[in-house]
Amino acid sequence: PEPPTACREKQYLINSQCCSLCQPGQKLVSDCTEFTETECLPCGESEFLDTWNRETHCHQHKYCDPNLGLRVQQKGTSETDTICTCEEGWHCTSEACESCVLHRSCSPGFGVKQIATGVSDTICEPCPVGFFSNVSSAFEKCHPWTSCETKDLVVQQAGTNKTDVVCGPQDRLRA
């Protein structure tokens, strides 16, 4: 019969014959022969292959280096890589999460719109009229100005985006 020029899914062409690819978690040790199937063997500890493959070497699991602020979020298996994330208060510098940086704080006049996660930085927003933030923080939102009226007081000093209003007693008309 004519040697094949293309093979089925999960097969590869070598020496004019179709051999089965190795399943995820296993590496290629020897191609198939006319007598035997492809010889595949499991990846070792701390190694993985995540696709049907003909790789002769497994990939090393990613190392989550604590010196770079990294920790293991999900331990790798023979079929999956280790997933790293950052220590509390830090976030990844890239999608691959190869290193971490400290979460950004929102300066006075700005509040936290979205708290940082292990993979995203703090998102700040300017405090709109009626709100303020007087601290540099990675957690604090803009706070609403104090309502003097509800306390039966009057505004003595207007608020800004960085300061609250100052309330004081209402002036009493003297007889």
Epitope: V29, S30, T36, E39, T56, H57
Partner: antibody
Framework: EVQLEESGGGLVQPGGSLRLSCAAS????????MCWVRQAPGKGLEWVAC?????????YYASWAKGRFTISKDTSKTTLYLQMNSLRAEDTAVYFC?????????WGQGTLVTVSS | DIVMTQSPSSLSASVGDRVTITCQAS??????LSWYQQKPGQAPKLLIY???TLASGVPSRFSGSGSGTDFTLTISSLQPEDFATYYC?????????????FGQGTKVVIK
């Protein structure tokens, strides 16, 4: 045709050295692990050493072969080698090369090594 | 190294007999067990791999079973061309080393 052919055997004195070769043909040498297995006259099969598939040189040896025997390959020549040093009378055997690591699907016909004074 | 203990070392049988050869590994080798047939002056021939997978072209009268440390080769009805020596071979791998081991062989002779 897919085949393996050993050469380099012969008579050697105790303490001497010998390098065996195994020429592979008809298959992709780079994607196949290769091993050496020996058989003393009238005795059983004995695993000697293996070399992994691929470009990085990962080798495995029977505990008795470590230090005296070295397996290597030249992918461009599709040839497997076994360097044998400090040979002893008990190393007298037919040496086979075989394709595979956890199983041996293809064997050469073997080359006879005789260690004698 | 992995040590494979094969028994019996020889057996006499007649054509048509059912023959069983056993092999024991010194430690668990999962299913990485192969069987070979060797005739005088020839290289071994792979019969069975991964405990029970028949190599292409091997007659179905040959079968293998077992797992872990204990394995069996069975020839259901011995044929004249089956008189030969049979070897088991185990493969063991850990994070630190790889080892192959052969059994001592079983010579099947005509009764």
């Amino acid at each position: 045709e897919v085949q393996l052919e050993e050469s380099g055997g012969g008579l050697v004195q105790p303490g001497g050295s010998l390098r065996l070769s195994c020429a592979a043909s008809g298959f992709d040498f780079s994607t196949n692990a290769m091993c050496w297995v020996r058989q003393a006259p009238g005795k059983g099969l004995e695993w000697v050493a293996c070399i992994a598939a691929g470009s990085s040189i990962i080798t495995y040896y029977a505990s008795w072969a470590k230090g005296r025997f070295t397996i290597s390959k030249d992918t461009s020549k599709t040839t497997l080698y076994l360097q044998m040093n400090s040979l002893r009378a008990e190393d007298t055997a037919v040496y086979f090369c075989a394709r595979g690591l956890s199983r041996f699907a293809l064997w050469g016909q073997g080359t006879l090594v005789t260690v004698s004074s | 190294d992995i040590v494979m203990t094969q028994s019996p070392s020889s057996l006499s049988a007649s054509v048509g007999d059912r023959v069983t050869i056993t092999c024991q590994a010194s430690q668990s080798i999962s299913s990485y067990l192969s069987w070979y047939q060797q005739k005088p002056g020839q290289a071994p021939k792979l019969l069975i791999y991964l405990t029970s997978t028949l190599a292409s072209g091997v007659p179905s009268r040959f079968s293998g079973s077992g797992s872990g440390t204990d394995f069996t080769l069975t020839i259901s009805s011995l044929q004249p061309e089956d008189f030969a020596t049979y070897y088991c071979q185990g493969y063991y791998s850990s994070s630190s080393y790889v080892s192959n081991g052969f059994g001592q062989g079983t010579k099947v002779v005509i009764k």
